[in-house]
């Protein structure tokens, strides 16, 4: 069977939503009312990888766009980017490791750890309107905890 993909939105633990900031960047900010329609809808695919009760490997694409969050080295630092792919070949069950995140849920906290770079997480800043990035620290100033709202296709 082909890979299963479900639509969802994410909010960080400060209730900031994620929106597009230019063609290849996401930013986090507080949204209300009608503005909530600006938030990015992800197509989350359940992909091949090491799995446990608390950890599920996923890929995070942008709904109806051929863009996926991926983790690559830039200037020797693990970096989060939006990468364009061939829609004829994606999503797929065996995604390249740079596209894979371990969705980890423990005690009402949801984290997205890079499979390519263990202990690096999708992160947001405390400040408003700042880019979503890959962070190497948990429990510090930056936010690595999210909630997920699945939405109908």
């Amino acid at each position: 069977a082909p890979v299963r993909s479900l639509n969802c939105t994410l909010r960080d633990s400060q209730q900031k939503s994620l929106v597009m900031s230019g063609p290849y960047e996401l930013k986090a900010l507080h949204l209300q009312g009608q503005d909530m329609e600006q938030q990015v809808v992800f197509s989350m695919s359940f992909v091949q990888g090491e799995e446990s009760n608390d950890k599920i490997p996923v890929a995070l694409g942008l709904k109806e766009k051929n863009l996926y969050l991926s983790c690559v080295l830039k200037d020797d630092k693990p970096t989060l980017q939006l990468e364009s792919v061939d829609p004829k070949n994606y999503p797929k069950k065996k995604m390249e490791k740079r596209f894979v995140f371990n969705k980890i849920e423990i005690n009402n906290k949801l984290e997205f750890e890079s499979a390519q770079f263990p202990n690096w997480y999708i992160s947001t800043s405390q400040a408003e309107n700042m880019p979503v990035f890959l962070g190497g620290t948990k429990g510090g100033q930056d936010i690595t905890d999210f909630t997920m709202q699945f939405v109908s296709s």
């Epitope: 299963r4 479900l6 969802c8 849920e105 009402n108 999210f146 909630t147 997920m148 699945f150 296709s153």
Partner: antibody, heavy 119, light 107 residues
Framework: EVQLVESGGGVVQPGRSLRLSCSSS????????MSWVRQAPGKGLEWVAY????????YYPDTVKGRFTISRDNSKNTLFLQMDSLRPEDTGVYYC????????????WGQGTPVTVSS | DIQMTQSPSSLSASVGDRVTITCRAS??????LNWYQQTPGKAPKLLIY???TLADGVPSRFSGSSSGTDYTFTISSLQPEDIATYYC?????????FGQGTKLQIT
């Protein structure tokens, strides 16, 4: 024995609220995603709410979105469904069920609690 | 939403008969399908998941198979305790939806 027991159902007027509870035993509640599924009188089954095992993920179909809120207390092995702005079409038996988005199936069900929305 | 259509909506059969119920999806659901049994006045019970895998403790007379967008549920030899309504349910896309049910009676 693995068991789910619902409570909190009853008769309520349109526009009012009701809070359902589901108590679990016989399995490690905090390790399982949970859902509510309803059945209108003489009708089929409809999945109305989902919450992930830790509570960080939720889902509602469009029929109840914005009116129903699912939550859980893992320390008390209990699942909840807060139903606001109730409508006559919300009438039915509400089942608490183990399972949801990821596995896709519901493998343990409670006996159900009836909800009637009528003036 | 993906619609699940079961046929027949009801049927009667005799003890020992082979019984077949079909569920058709309005789009491809790639074997992401489950079957449930609901006996009168009781909660549903999971019988089959992933189109053909028997749930724990379910008798081997129950089976499931698929062909394209058609999914088949079979009872190889009907028993009196099998009087129930049977439901299919897909989990390919949200919302996961159930078929309208097939009521099985014994003649």
């Amino acid at each position: 024995e693995v068991q789910l027991v619902e409570s909190g159902g009853g008769v309520v007027q349109p526009g009012r609220s009701l809070r359902l509870s589901c108590s679990s035993s016989g399995f490690i509640f905090s390790r399982y995603d949970m859902s509510w599924v309803r059945q209108a009188p003489g009708k089929g089954l409809e999945w109305v709410a989902y919450i992930s095992h830790g509570g960080a993920g939720t889902y509602y179909p469009d029929t109840v979105k914005g009116r129903f809120t699912i939550s859980r207390d893992n320390s008390k092995n209990t699942l909840f469904l807060q139903m606001d702005s109730l409508r006559p079409e919300d009438t039915g038996v509400y089942y608490c069920a183990r399972g949801g988005v990821y596995k896709g199936y519901f493998d343990v069900w409670g006996q159900g609690t009836p909800v009637t929305v009528s003036s | 939403d993906i619609q699940m259509t079961q046929s027949p909506s009801s049927l009667s059969a005799s003890v020992g008969d082979r019984v077949t119920i079909t569920c058709r999806a309005s789009g491809n659901i790639y074997t992401y399908l489950n079957w449930y049994q609901q006996t009168p006045g009781k909660a549903p019970k999971l019988l089959i998941y992933d189109a053909k895998t028997l749930a724990d403790g379910v008798p081997s007379r129950f089976s499931g198979s698929s062909s394209g967008t058609d999914y088949t549920f079979t009872i190889s030899s009907l028993q009196p305790e099998d009087i129930a309504t049977y439901y299919c349910q897909h989990f390919w896309r949200l919302p996961y939806t159930f078929g309208q049910g097939t009521k099985l009676q014994i003649t």
